[in-house]
């Protein structure tokens, strides 16, 4: 008799999830010599242990601690790039500027990027049919808690000037409810971080407005200033030109506003 299964509002676990995580771990540790000591089978076991047999609306940061411990990684604290609603450009940037890091350039971020997963209470099965949606079902689901945990740790590690790439095409350039707005901003350490520098990425080719004056950016500035961290903002009017200048900063066109 088929067992009754909880129907959640979100998509189910990504197909071939265990194989994908394991393969990504192997690939990452091969490419990054400083992580070659990592045992990927142990990483998968710790990942699995965080959510398997647990109610997918009752996951805690504590559940992920064994995985966090295995995935401990030191990135240069002054080369951190946060992003909000503009992941692709942020990743294109760090692919060229190899000594700067987004969360997804770290082992744990790389393992989970774009994946969904959840289990079921009291069974060792992975649920491939549906997983809880953050809004419609519950916030303490395996995916949300994972990203909250790794994002908090990533922000806590930052120092000097922390950069954040923001999407200037959105109605809320800074969104308090995003991972950046709800987790990372509040976990920057004022004793280590001197400045948060926002890069506002323009969408339209002829958009010459100063989006650093946007009310949501002013709200971000206020939050950051109250935390005793300086705030600065730069418009990136031409993201295509920006990437070209990252690739080739000696180019004469890179002496003008990007």
């Amino acid at each position: 008799v088929p067992r009754w299964r909880q129907q959640w509002s979100g998509p189910g676990t990504t197909k071939r999830f265990p194989e994908t995580v394991l393969a990504r771990c192997v690939k990452y540790t091969e490419i990054h010599p400083e992580m070659r000591h990592v045992d990927c089978q142990s990483v998968w076991d710790a990942f699995k242990g965080a959510f398997i047999s647990k109610h997918p609306c009752n996951i805690t940061e504590e559940d992920y601690q064994p995985l966090m411990k295995l995935g401990t990684q030191t990135v240069p604290c002054n080369k951190i790039l946060l992003w909000s609603r503009i992941k692709d450009l942020a990743h294109q940037f760090t692919q060229v500027q190899r000594d700067m890091f987004t969360l997804e350039d770290t082992l744990l971020g790389y393992l989970a990027d774009d994946l969904t997963w959840c289990g079921e209470f009291n069974t060792s099965k992975i649920n491939y049919q549906s997983c809880p949606d953050w809004r419609k079902d519950c916030s303490n689901n395996p995916v949300s808690v994972f990203w909250k945990t790794v994002s908090r740790r990533f922000a806590e590690a930052a120092c000097d000037v922390v950069h954040v790439m923001l999407n200037g095409s959105r109605s809320k350039i800074f969104d308090k409810n995003s991972t950046f707005g709800s987790v990372e901003v509040h976990n920057l350490q004022p004793e280590k971080v001197q400045t948060l520098e926002a890069w506002v990425i323009h969408g339209g080719r002829e958009d010459s407005r100063d989006l650093c004056q946007d009310p949501t950016i002013k709200e971000l500035e206020s939050i950051i200033s109250k935390r005793n961290i300086q705030f600065s903002c730069k418009n990136i009017y031409r993201p295509d030109k920006f990437l070209q200048c990252v690739k080739n900063p000696e180019d004469s066109s890179c002496t003008s506003e990007i």
Epitope: N78, K79, Q97, D99, M100, D160, V161, H163, Q194, T195, E197, W199, Q230, S232, C233, K234, C245, V246, P249, E250, C254, T255, S256, E257, I258
Partner: nanobody, 124 residues
Framework: EVQLVESGGGLVQAGESLRLSCAAG???????MGWFRQAPGKEREFVAA????????WYGDSVKGRFTISRDNAKNTVYLQMNNLKPEDTAVYYC??????????????????WGQGTQVTVAS
Amino acid sequence: EVQLVESGGGLVQAGESLRLSCAAGRTFTNLGMGWFRQAPGKEREFVAADTWSGTSTWYGDSVKGRFTISRDNAKNTVYLQMNNLKPEDTAVYYCAARLRGWITTRKPNEYDYWGQGTQVTVAS
């Protein structure tokens, strides 16, 4: 090619102030600027830097709260305001530029262009 020319060094008493200037031979747009210093027999030490916005700044621990880096983009000049100088601040001060102005760094080898240096001597 970015030509950097420092000025403003000299001999001062402990507790006094100095302002160093560094003029660049091209527009500052997108450049990140930094100041380093080197005392006799010691390694070059990070003092202060900014990013391409000109408003993001960070400092070496020994000068934090006493030194301020700033820039005037119209004049293509970066400044280092040094207050409450101490004898241990005595060194040759160098201005440096990064073509990748978005990078935050304290490492001298990540700067592309350097000035010739200006001597600062603080007497006790």
